[in-house]
């Protein structure tokens, strides 16, 4: 008894496909081709077993609500159109809906609308205030702000990490040691070696220190102060100790002596 899809129906049900987020209202419109004197208009949902479950009805100028009061039928002023709404749609409201009408005697007639599909999707923004729903989630703007701040913090941390790595790999550069010696005659370790500039440090023996100075730990540039130490005559050879008092008679550097920056 399955009849083919009919090209014309006195009842229309639109939209054919409707998607709403959970918590929002879902509204279909059922429209009659004309307005008979006496009729009953029903709103149905198709069950998984292809049975119709009546949700609500309109009869004799009155609404007949179904068991679930979330399903509402409203007659519009033109008399032909009816809004069929699900208040605060739930995920399990997804399914196939249709409306049907029976025009009562003397000429009893049944009409069914084409079917329409409702899809209720999970809520992604803030839940509506009108119905209970999942715990609130971050709004779009707030999410953007959090992501932005997080990105900046990660960037700063990466920058600090990079600085620390550079300080560990190139300790002289971070301590401010200058390159001395002739640029014209670079020392080479071998035929293929890159130019290497050497610097002889004089060791300062600060007499008021109670213990042997520890090797200076790599430190951030902003925590380092620099002084220019000038040695009279030729630069000290490795291992030579100079007393702190010898700094008092320091002379201005001669052109052949490159300036040496020492962390204090």
């Amino acid at each position: 008894l399955d009849s083919p899809d009919r090209p014309w129906s006195p009842l229309t049900f639109s939209p054919a496909q409707l998607t709403v987020q959970e918590g929002e209202n879902a509204t279909f419109t059922c429209s009659l081709a004309d307005i008979p004197d006496s009729f009953v208009l029903n709103w149905y949902r198709l069950s998984p077993r292809n049975q119709t479950d009546k949700l609500a009805a309109f009869q004799e100028d009155r609404i007949e609500p179904g068991r679930d009061r979330r399903f509402r039928v409203t007659r519009l002023p033109n008399g032909r159109d009816f809004h069929m709404s699900i208040v605060a749609a739930r995920l399990n409201d997804s399914g196939i809906y249709l409306c049907g009408a029976i025009y009562l005697p003397p000429n009893t007639q049944i009409n069914e609308s084409p079917r329409a599909e409702l899809s209720v999707t999970e809520r992604t923004l803030e839940p509506p205030t009108q119905s209970p729903s999942p715990p609130p989630r971050l709004s779009g703007q707030l999410q953007g702000l959090v992501i932005g701040v997080t990105s900046v913090l990660v960037g700063v941390l990466l920058l600090l990490l990079l600085t620390w790595v550079l300080a560990a790999v190139f300790p002289r550069a971070t301590r401010g040691a200058c390159v001395c010696g002739s640029e014209d005659e670079p020392l080479k370790e071998g035929p293929d070696a890159a130019p290497v500039f050497t610097l002889d440090y004089g060791e300062l023996d600060f007499q008021w220190r109670e213990k042997t100075p520890e090797p200076p730990a790599p430190c951030a540039p902003e925590q380092t102060e620099y002084a220019t130490i000038v040695f009279p005559g030729r630069p000290a050879s490795p291992g030579r100790r100079a007393s702190a008092s010898s700094l008092q008679g320091a002379q201005p550097p001669s052109p052949e002596d490159g300036p040496g920056l020492w962390p204090l």
Epitope: L1, D2, S3, P4, R6, W8, S9, P10, N42, Y44, L46, N50, Q51, T52, K54, L98, G100, I102, N107, T108, Q109, I110, N111, E112, S113, R115
Partner: nanobody
Framework: EVQLVESGGGEVKPGGSLRLSCVAS????????MGWFRQAPGKEREFVAG????????YYADAVKGRFTISRDHAKNTVYLQMSSLRAEDTAVYYC?????????????WGQGTQVTVKP
């Protein structure tokens, strides 16, 4: 042309139940809706229940709501009327009816009827 044959009528006590069947034959592909009417002695024929053939939308007269259930079985070309909590005023000849199209009426085709009697 569609032919309709009813069955399942009989005599029952108040509060009892009956199930009526209506088998359609012939050009059943054209059926759009089917239903049941009844006619008590000395009264006009009245609508009892109807069902849309494709969507399965169902309709009932106020007098039988909650007591009668209409259903259909496509495979058997059959429509059923399950009647429960029967009352004396339900006594009548029950007719099966078919509507041929959306523009037709539930009365394009009629069966011969089956008698239902409710008495103590």
């Amino acid at each position: 042309e569609v032919q309709l044959v009813e069955s399942g009528g009989g005599e029952v006590k108040p509060g009892g139940s009956l199930r009526l069947s209506c088998v359609a034959s012939g050009r059943t592909v054209s059926i759009y809706a089917m239903g049941w009417f009844r006619q008590a002695p000395g009264k006009e024929r009245e609508f009892v229940a109807g069902i849309g053939w494709n969507g399965g939308t169902t309709y009932y007269a106020d007098a039988v709501k909650g007591r009668f259930t209409i259903s259909r079985d496509h495979a058997k070309n059959t429509v059923y009327l399950q009647m429960s909590s029967l009352r004396a005023e339900d006594t009548a000849v029950y007719y099966c009816a078919a509507q041929e199209s959306a523009a037709g009426t539930l009365g394009d085709y009629w069966g011969q009827g089956t008698q239902v009697t409710v008495k103590p």
